[in-house]
């Protein structure tokens, strides 16, 4: 029995379908077929689970948390026992294994691994403004999603016919800040946050108002 | 088995436009982002910007912008980066490097073998 | 955009020896820098991120450190395989930016 090289790993956008592969080649019928598939999931990695096992010619439930959302892509019994797994959680990320036996057909290598990656875009952003809003202080513009796999990146822009930042501006892309030193009234505006990673953006807005001092009365 | 397989070297004129491709295998196209990066020769590393293969947003660098056009295509697993108005000094290798599978678009984990493209008169 | 600037631009050493390269960003960028190597006729290849993270498969032997405007790069005992260029590359602002490389050659 030889269980073939799977991809390596898969990733999907959570909400989305996962197809986990899994085929072997054997020398018996598949009368005494068994197959156990595992995840060691990346949350909890010393706490390997049963996601769905194939025994006696009828299927079983692995883990409540799959119950529902995991099945085999074909029907049983066949030498491809891939599974799919419906409406992927974060939680489904981790090292997948289908182990295969099939009596009397034994040697050989009768596991496959398959790593899963479920993908986030960005929650919707938090924008906030850190510091004085008088005119000639130092502000700082932060955004931050909660979510996000991979790591979004963070691009802050002024909404105005440019949609450049002052001239006085930084900004951390990776953590969403922007500073803004010594802000002016040509600083007040709408600011936009933009969050973005390869499956997805999220914005929030930002109303920068810049305060100028109150003449004072003499007399 | 993540493999980046870039088209041939290419010569062009100044003035002309090259399209180099990228064809992605060993993982989910559609999940990641490919950046486009370009070497001079005997020079450093330029980034020229990202496109997302999932839903086409790109982000390019500002000196190459409204020259140049990132696009991707789902069905075949491949990126593409056109570059117009070609001058001498676009002569490099341009290479696809696929984002980070942890921090992301801002470093790239896998590349392809690079494309000499060469402007001469 | 943010200048990178590598410091030697070559490096003579031997096998065995700990050799360390810098990089200097114009402005502080954090903990946002990898740093990769690269070979003649090759892709270049990442070797850390975030500033210290190794990534999977490379040698231990590598090490990176530092944040705001100084980093370096470490290897601890040079191998034959480690003689190449490598850059250090930002990613605190867009355009990432890199630096112009450090060569490290066999003395």
């Known amino acids: 029995l030889e269980v073939s090289e799977s991809p390596g790993s898969i990733q999907v956008a959570r909400g989305q379908p996962a197809v986990l592969p899994c085929t072997f080649t054997t020398s018996a019928a598949l009368i005494n077929l068994n197959v156990i598939w595992m995840v060691t999931p990346l949350s909890n990695a010393n706490q390997p689970e049963q996601v769905i096992l194939y025994q006696g010619g009828q299927m079983f439930d692995g883990a409540p948390r799959f119950h529902g959302r995991v099945g085999f892509t074909g029907t049983m019994p066949a030498t491809n026992v891939s599974i799919f797994i419906n409406n992927t959680q974060l939680s489904d990320t981790g090292t997948y294994q289908c182990l295969v036996n099939n009596l009397p057909d034994i040697g050989g290598r009768n596991i496959g691994v398959t790593g899963l990656t479920v993908l986030v875009p960005p929650s919707a952003p938090h924008c906030q403004i850190q510091g004085s809003q008088d005119i000639g202080s130092d502000v700082i513009l932060l955004c931050s999603s909660e979510e996000g796999i991979p790591r979004p990146t963070y691009l802050w822009e002024k909404l105005d016919n440019t949609l450049k930042l002052p001239p006085t501006a930084t900004q951390d892309q990776v953590q969403g800040t922007v500073t803004i030193r010594n802000i002016s009234a040509l600083s007040s505006g709408l600011y936009q946050c933009v969050a973005s990673n390869a499956i997805g953006t999220s914005t929030c807005l930002l109303d920068l108002q810049v305060i100028s001092p109150q003449p004072r009365n003499i007399g | 088995q993540v493999q980046l397989v870039q088209s041939g070297a290419e010569v062009k004129k100044p003035g002309a436009s090259v399209k180099v491709s990228c064809k992605a295998s060993?993982?989910?196209?559609?999940?990641?982002?490919i950046s486009w990066v370009r070497q001079a020769p005997g020079q450093g590393l330029e980034w020229m910007g990202w496109i997302s293969a999932y839903n086409g947003n790109t982000n390019y660098a500002q000196k190459l912008q409204g020259r140049v056009t990132m696009t991707t295509d789902t069905s075949t697993s491949t990126a593409y980066m056109e570059l117009r108005s070609l001058r001498s000094d676009d002569t490099a290798v341009y290479y696809c490097?696929?984002?980070?599978?942890?921090?992301?678009?801002?470093?790239?984990?896998?590349w392809g073998q690079g494309t000499l493209v060469t402007v001469s008169s | 955009d943010i200048v990178m600037t590598q410091s030697p631009s070559t490096l003579s050493a031997s096998v065995g020896d700990r050799v360390t390269i810098t990089c200097r960003a114009s402005q502080s960028i954090s903990s946002w820098l990898a740093w990769y190597q690269q070979k003649p006729g090759k892709a270049p290849k990442l070797l850390i991120y975030d500033a210290s993270s190794l990534e999977s498969g490379v040698p231990s032997r590598f090490s990176g450190s530092g944040s705001g405007t100084e980093f370096t790069l470490t290897i601890s005992s040079l191998q034959p395989d480690d003689f190449a260029t490598y850059y250090c590359?930002?990613?605190?602002?867009?355009?990432?930016?890199f630096g112009q490389g450090t060569k490290v050659e066999i003395k």
């Open positions: 590359q930002q990613y605190n602002s867009y355009p990432w930016t």
């Open positions: 060993g993982y989910t196209f559609t999940s990641y982002g």
């Open positions: 490097a696929r984002d980070h599978s942890i921090v992301g678009a801002t470093t790239f984990d896998y």
